[in-house]
């Protein structure tokens, strides 16, 4: 488990860091998890990349950010925001959110406390 370098991380600093990293592998990894590796997911050519590879790429990207709960929360919220319109129904939204919540642990980070993933203004 990686140790936190700071208590929280400044919000503007986190926003800049989240803007800088590539969250696509994380989005792809989660979509693969909820769609199943056999099913085709229109938005990405995911068939060529195994989910475990995407997970590693995702973790590598998240590793580029300052390891604070604040920045991790910001990244997870951005992933949710990016994929919101692609989630077809309430069940899919819940599945995506569940997988998203597991992501920090999969990458050996501490899960962010108090992180509100319902950030899409009711769209998700």
């Amino acid at each position: 488990m990686r140790r936190e370098r700071g208590r929280q991380g400044d919000s503007s600093s986190c926003e800049r860091q989240v803007d800088r990293v590539n969250l696509k592998p994380c989005e792809q990894h989660i979509m693969q998890r909820i769609m199943g590796e056999q099913e085709q997911y229109d938005s990405y050519d995911i068939r060529s990349t195994r989910s475990s590879d995407q997970q590693q790429r995702c973790c590598d990207e998240l590793n580029e950010m300052e390891n604070t709960q604040r920045c991790m929360c910001e990244a997870l919220q951005q992933i949710m925001e990016n994929q919101c319109d692609r989630l077809q129904d309430r069940q899919m939204v819940q599945q995506f959110k569940r997988e998203l919540m597991n992501l920090p642990q999969q990458c050996n980070f501490r899960a962010p406390q108090r992180c509100d993933l319902d950030v899409s203004g009711g769209r998700c």
Epitope: Q8, D10, Q113, R114, C115, D116, V119
Partner: antibody, heavy 123, light 110 residues
């Protein structure tokens, strides 16, 4: 029935110290975050401090950090607030509250409150 | 001066609907959950809404909560004289590592 009963409030001189206690019953104390919240006379609510279930993490309002210490005794189901170097700005009713915060993806919320105890700092 | 901004007072007639706003920033309401409290005169506050929209058991469905961006709203329908009280919003601020309360809104039922 959940009950939180504060004690230890008093009139104290500026620069003095005081220890508030909160006896909890009706729930498993060791599984909840606990929080002190205060209210100056005629004013709004002000969060003072949080303590994690096992006491390993504490957060404080900036103006009390270094002067106040929140602690707990899970064996006795008691929450404490040790207040040092008190000033007039610390005057108010202090509430002991149960915090519903869980380990991740949830927020702070205060679902049970004590009746409040008055702390007056004046010479 | 509270970081979370609420209207100081609001009034409405019995039976009407009112909304109380709570405005913050990205580091508090924008990224964290909001709760709402009712404080009747000379009593301890009581939890009305937690995690933005959830009601504890015992709170009537006349009370509702919502959040959009960096603002949250408490709605009260079918106003009753017993609803006359102060209402406070609260949330965690990730930059300050502290819970913030709004300044409070005094609701008068005319």
């Amino acid at each position: 029935e959940v009950q939180l009963v504060e004690s230890g409030g008093a009139l104290v001189q500026p620069g003095g110290s005081l220890r508030l206690s909160c006896a909890a019953s009706g729930f498993k104390f060791s599984t909840f975050y606990m929080t002190w919240i205060r209210q100056a006379p005629g004013k709004g609510l002000e969060w003072v401090a949080n303590i994690k279930q096992d006491g390993s993490e504490k957060d404080y309002l900036d103006s009390v950090r270094g002067r106040f210490n929140i602690s707990r005794d899970n064996a006795k189901s008691v929450l404490y607030l040790q207040m040092n170097t008190l000033s007039a700005d610390d005057t108010g009713v202090y509430y002991c509250t149960r915090n519903g915060l869980q380990d991740s993806y949830s927020g702070d919320f205060f679902d049970h409150w004590g009746q409040g105890i008055l702390v007056t700092v004046s010479s | 001066q509270s970081v979370l901004t609420q209207p100081p007072s609001i009034s409405a007639a019995p039976g009407q609907k009112v909304t109380i706003s709570c405005s913050g920033t990205g580091s508090n309401i924008g990224h964290n959950y909001v709760s709402w409290y009712q404080q009747l005169p000379r009593t301890a506050p009581r939890l009305l809404i937690f995690d933005n929209t959830k009601r504890p058991s015992g709170i009537p469905d006349r009370f509702s909560g919502s959040k959009s961006g960096s603002s949250a709203t408490l709605g009260i329908t079918g106003l009753q004289t017993g609803d006359e009280a102060h209402y406070f919003c609260a949330t965690w601020d990730a930059d300050l590592s502290a819970v913030l309360f709004g300044g409070g809104t005094k609701l008068t039922v005319l």
